[in-house]
């Protein structure tokens, strides 16, 4: 069985301020079980943008219905983009662990650039 890979097909995305950014991510397998999370930045200081398991992320919606048992599309939309949202976004697959889930595979990242609104 092929090991799961996390695919972020877009190296970069350019979005106008005030618009919605779509960040694409797919997994190549349903196994191992575990949640997907999105982060801005890498390393210890990275910012959690979306967690499939829990939390309230009012600006974020998923492109697909993640409650489908065969879902492998973890793309997200982030609304009302501002220049402060610029950065590199990573789609990260975790595998279940006890007591905490363990990072398993990360996508290569998508750089979000924000074009200022014309004045």
């Amino acid at each position: 069985e092929e090991e799961l890979q996390v695919i972020q097909p877009d190296k970069s995305v350019l979005v106008a301020a005030g618009e919605t950014a779509t960040l694409r991510c797919t997994a190549t397998s349903l196994i191992p079980v575990g949640p997907i999370q999105w982060f801005r930045g890498a390393g210890p200081g990275r910012e959690l943008i979306y967690n499939q398991k829990e939390g309230h992320f009012p600006r974020v919606t998923t492109v697909s219905d993640l409650t489908k048992r065969n879902n492998m599309d973890f793309s997200i939309r982030i609304g009302n983009i501002t220049p402060a949202d610029a950065g590199t976004y990573y789609c990260v697959k975790f595998r279940k662990g006890s007591p905490d889930d363990v990072e398993f595979k990360s996508g290569a990242g998508t750089e979000l650039s924000v074009r200022a609104k014309p004045s």
């Epitope: 349903l30 079980v33 398991k53 993640l66 409650t67 048992r69 006890s98 007591p99």
Partner: antibody, heavy 118, light 109 residues
Amino acid sequence: EVQLVESGGGVVQPGGSLRLSCAASGFTFSSNAMSWVRQAPGKGLEWVAGISAGGSDTYYPASVKGRFTISRDNSKNTLYLQMNSLRAEDTAVYYCARETWNHLFDYWGQGTLVTVSS
Amino acid sequence: SYELTQPPSVSVSPGQTARITCSGGSYSSYYYAWYQQKPGQAPVTLIYSDDKRPSNIPERFSGSSSGTTVTLTISGVQAEDEADYYCGGYDQSSYTNPFGGGTKLTVLG
């Protein structure tokens, strides 16, 4: 407070049909996958159907596939189970259950009894 | 027949620790939960995602996993804990929700 209230149970003859309903409240129904789980008298729990939040994808074990149909109306916050070609072995209490993000169950209704008997 | 295997019965004295095991699922494709059911009542979720406890469940109930076996531990068992306990799972490889046959917990005395 999450509430799930089943209805529609009763006595039906073998080969007959019945539709169960589950009225949901206290949470955003359209955001959660849902399932039906049954329990025959004196027996254990058996999952019989699941449905995605949007309602487009449904799942069944072999024991009921082709006879039972799960559906939902998100505008009415209601889950359904259409049961056809009923058999004596379908006699059970039927519970609706809310699914967690990973398809386990966190909240259960009180159940409705279905008796298949001639 | 049940896909998940758990003992039919466990007996324990009040104040002691009860452990109920469940096995049968592949670690990489399974999530487990534990459900408590008292006579004439609906099941109540005690543990989900192998070891996570809902906020309304007493701390004496805990879940753990080791390989393909999960364990429900009830510390300081009380008379009110006498009930049937079901192990349930989600199998990502088949999109199904198997259950164990249930374990009757008897609190002695």
